[in-house]
């Protein structure tokens, strides 16, 4: 029962995470225009991966997209790839893991195949999660040392020199939105791991059962049956005896509320 | 077509408030924030500020703090100005404006400010 | 506030003639964001509203004449207009459309002779 709920939870918590994960992925604001240095712009902008906006005094925002591929900073094309790999990562991870999932049954499914399911979906969400948080804080690393370099006033213009303040970037809601995720996926992925332990057969150890067979006093003790990890194995310890005890396998074998969705 | 109707010209007592409104109508109200400007007879633009109409979040020209409060209906796609503690300073005639780039104002609401 | 100095207050030209209206920021307009300066042009007809001309400094409205050209850069900025005529009579203002409160220009009145 705590093994189902575990491995259940474990879910639940990298579903939310990936869609997490996911959600700040496509969000625009991984950096904002910090308005410390200019707090009553009219014009406010910010930026995700694949866009820029700006929004004007009409309330109006306007999207470019970033058309180059290899005009783009590397550290952003990094921070891509990290952000693709853990949904990828994630995705499949919750493919498997729903049919790893030990309240839903699929044919005669041992629980070994779903014990090692269950390890492969918790390895990736483990995976997808630290994906997540190292595109997060290599995006918030450039962040920082962007904002520090930016110098307060820069001279530009057109035939002679003129005042700008430059537009400085700080964290965007998409970063906190990024490392949550990740960490929701992480924690999800070491329940899936936890819940994995559980599931997985072990050497079972029967409570030894005395016999007095006529003149000699022998005491059977059943328990060399090792538990075979492998798909499609018979892993079920079987009944040595007719009066012996049965196996905690066999106790849970009977349908439960737990065996349909 | 994109309009901003605005409602009539006031005369009204110094001390006394008045409210005007300005209906929208051909774009999605809540899409666009709603300007004012004032400008007395003769001169240039002021700008009094905002009113965001999806939220109803203002912004307003520190000089006219307490002066203009911004509203919003949205289920008349209206905004409405009010004015309180009318001097002749105020008399001028109301802008409301919207649209990106402010590309649309109404008609202007004159607003006479006389004993 | 950001300052929006126009020149000159007024201008008497004859019909035909190019105009050139002058209008400085006492602080740069352009937004590093998407490199564009927050600058609009309005025309306004006596007892009418002003109407928009040009915004970015230099992108005309839709329906507006080519005659009208709007040009310049962070803290100044040019409205031209080419070949003027009768019904360009009016006030043409500047506005900062990039910080807060956002401010016009005294105008240039525009007169024909």
């Known amino acids: 029962m705590a093994v189902t709920a575990c491995q259940g939870l474990g879910f639940v918590v990298s579903l939310i995470g990936i869609a997490g994960i996911i959600a700040a992925t496509c969000m625009d604001q991984w950096s904002t225009q910090d308005l410390y240095n200019n707090p009553v712009t009219a014009v406010f902008n910010y930026q995700g991966l694949w866009r820029s906006c700006v929004r004007e005094s009409s309330g109006f925002t306007e999207c470019r997209g970033y058309f180059t591929l290899l005009g783009l900073p590397a550290m952003l094309q990094a921070v891509r790839a990290l952000m693709i790999v853990g949904i990828v990562l994630g995705a499949i991870g919750l493919l498997v893991s729903i049919f790893a999932l030990k309240c839903i049954r699929i044919g005669s499914m041992e629980d070994s195949a779903k014990a090692n399911m269950t390890l492969t979906s918790g390895i990736m969400f483990i995976v997808s999660g630290l994906c997540a948080i190292a595109g997060v804080s290599v995006f918030a690393n450039m962040l920082v040392t962007n904002f520090w370099m930016s110098t307060a006033n820069m001279y530009t213009g057109m035939g002679g020199m003129v005042q700008t303040v430059q537009t400085r970037y700080t964290f965007g809601a998409a970063l906190f939105v990024g490392w949550v995720a990740g960490g929701l996926t992480l924690i999800g992925g070491v329940m899936m791991c936890i819940a994995c332990r559980g599931l997985a057969p072990e050497e079972t150890n029967y409570k030894a059962v005395s016999y007095h067979a006529s003149g000699h006093s022998v005491a059977y003790k059943p328990g060399g049956f090792k538990a075979s990890t492998g798909f499609g194995s018979n892993t079920k310890n079987k009944k040595i005896y007719d009066g012996g005890a049965r196996t905690e396998d066999e106790v849970q074998s009977y349908p439960s509320k737990h065996d349909y969705v | 077509e994109v309009q901003l109707q605005q409602s009539g010209p006031e005369l009204v007592k110094p001390g006394a408030s008045v409210k005007m409104s300005c209906k929208a109508s051909?774009?999605?109200?809540?899409?666009?924030?709603v300007h004012w400007v004032k400008q007395k007879p003769g001169q240039g633009l002021e700008w009094i500020g905002y009113?965001?109409?999806?939220?109803?979040?203002?912004k307003y020209n520190e000089k006219f703090k307490g002066k203009a409060t911004l509203t919003s209906d949205k289920s008349s796609s209206t905004a409405y100005m009010d004015l309180s503690s009318l001097t002749s300073e105020d008399s001028a005639v109301y802008y409301c404006?919207?649209?990106?780039?402010?590309?649309?104002w109404g008609q202007g609401t004159l607003v006479t400010v006389s004993a | 506030d950001i300052v929006m100095t126009q020149s000159p207050s007024s201008l008497t030209v004859t019909a035909g003639e190019k105009v050139t209206m002058s209008c400085k920021s006492s602080?740069?307009?352009?937004?590093?964001?998407?490199?564009?300066?927050?600058l609009t042009w309005y025309q306004q007809k006596p007892g009418q509203a002003p109407k928009l001309l040009i915004y970015?400094?230099?992108t005309r409205e839709s329906g507006v004449p080519d005659r009208f050209i709007g040009s310049g850069s962070g803290t100044d900025f040019t409205l031209t207009i080419s070949h003027v005529q009768a019904e360009d009579l009016a006030v043409y203002f500047c506005?900062?459309?990039?910080?807060?409160?956002?401010?016009f220009g005294a105008g240039t009145n525009l007169e024909l002779k």
């Open positions: 404006l919207s649209l990106r780039f402010f590309a649309y």
């Open positions: 051909g774009y999605t109200f809540t899409n666009y924030f």
């Open positions: 009113i965001n109409p999806y939220n109803d979040d203002t």
């Open positions: 602080q740069s307009l352009l937004n590093s964001g998407n490199q564009k300066n927050y």
């Open positions: 970015w400094a230099s």
């Open positions: 506005q900062n459309d990039y910080s807060y409160p956002l401010t």
